[in-house]
């Protein structure tokens, strides 16, 4: 099947990093500077992403793969492939359209990014508060009050957990 397809479509022989040049009798031509093709059989090469302004280059563009950007210090990535950079705030703050604001009482943010989220209400899950929350940390819930009967072994609270909000594998 592969051979038949190759006979019918000479472009299928063009590897990544090249394109099938219609202007040159469908010969495989290398991608021009600042462009790439990540798969074989392409009829055009894609323009490389340019990391400008608050974006900085994490990985240079090659003939077979696009450039990858991240953000300059003081900013963090948002969206798949770091499509935008957003200003950092301090832990215990959130970024609003008017700038960084402290978390209100009853909310927390343990990252430099994102919003202040409400403390977990342990009682709604039938648990008790082991460690109180702060602007930077969620409360730590423990066993239900009924489980903490006299003579029960003491509970060591877990270390404060890192909040989600990082990139997929």
């Amino acid at each position: 099947f592969e051979r038949t397809r190759s006979l019918q479509d000479p472009c299928s022989n063009c590897p990544a990093g090249t394109f099938c040049d219609n202007n040159r009798n469908q010969i495989c031509s290398p991608c021009p500077p600042n462009s790439f093709s990540s798969a074989g059989g392409q009829r055009t090469c894609d323009i490389c992403r340019q990391c400008k302004g608050v974006f900085r280059t994490r990985k240079e563009c090659s003939s077979t793969s696009n450039a990858e950007c991240d953000c300059t210090p003081g900013f963090h990535c948002l969206g798949a492939g770091c499509s935008m950079c957003e200003q950092d705030c301090k832990q215990g703050q959130e970024l609003t359209k008017k700038g960084c604001k402290d978390c209100c009482f009853g909310t927390f943010n343990d990252q430099k990014r994102g919003i202040c989220r409400p403390w977990t209400n342990c009682s709604l899950d039938g648990k008790s508060v082991l460690v109180n929350g702060t602007k930077e940390r969620d409360v730590v819930c423990g066993p239900s009050p009924a489980d903490l009967s006299p003579g029960a072994s003491s509970v060591t609270p877990p270390a404060p957990a890192r909040e989600p909000g990082h990139s997929p594998q």
Epitope: P118, D125, V139, P164, S167
Partner: antibody, heavy 119, light 106 residues
């Protein structure tokens, strides 16, 4: 690639409980909040709450507080949403959705689980 | 609690521009996200952070947010754009969705 796969459809009687699961793959499970959103037949989207898979911390919409419990099992990258004291108007498709942090939005969704409450 | 108001339906001819609005008290001070949902399918994120387009979403989709109205604009509308569209914000510890707008392509 990121995938959220939910458990199958359920039929329950009024007053019963239902527990829906959502298995995550394609990313580090503890890196994304998981939210649950429901949609009654012919109606719009309604937020139920979230769980932080890293700490187990939760936040529930006011109208579900006392009836909903969200838990997770990090060993199998799965979150659960249990709704108790079911009523007829809990009949809906229940979706799990991932929130990558920042200002909450949902970039990946499960396929949905239809929960039917019928006597 | 915070409320988002969307028109129940919007109709548009193929090739024309569809405008879907989402009203809320000083919504311009909030961050708005938009979802598309086709019958029998889960919603799909089409715009986030007011005006950012996820990869894979056509450039025909754009959005803005100021004052009391956020707007999703779909230019050169195609039959495949027919769906329900929902706006969403974060307010006071809760995720809030608009009621949804059914876009009909004539």
């Amino acid at each position: 690639q990121v995938q959220l796969v939910e458990s199958g459809a359920e039929v329950k009687k009024p007053g019963a409980s239902v527990k829906v699961s959502c298995k995550a793959s394609g990313y580090t499970f503890t890196d994304y909040y998981i939210h649950w959103v429901r949609q009654a037949p012919g109606q719009g989207l309604e937020w139920v709450g979230w769980i932080n898979p890293n700490s187990g911390g939760t936040n529930y919409a006011q109208r579900f507080q006392g009836r909903v419990t969200m838990t997770r099992d990090t060993s199998i990258s799965t979150t659960y949403m249990e709704l108790s004291r079911l009523r007829f108007d809990d009949t809906a498709v229940y979706y799990c959705a991932s929130d990558p942090g920042g200002n909450p939005y949902f970039d990946y969704w499960g396929q949905g689980t239809l929960v039917t409450v019928s006597s | 609690s915070y409320e988002l108001t969307q028109p129940p339906s919007v109709s548009v001819a193929p090739g024309k521009t569809a405008t879907i609005t989402c009203g809320g008290d000083t919504i311009g001070s909030k961050v708005v996200h938009w979802y598309q949902q086709k019958p029998g399918q889960a919603p799909v994120l089409v715009m986030y952070y007011d005006s950012e387009r996820p990869s894979g979403i056509p450039e025909r989709f754009s959005a803005s947010n100021s004052g009391n109205t956020a707007t999703l604009t779909i230019s050169r509308v195609e039959a495949g754009d027919e769906a329900d569209y929902y706006c969403q914000v974060w307010d006071s510890g809760s995720v809030v969705f608009g009621g949804g707008t059914k876009l009909t392509v004539l």
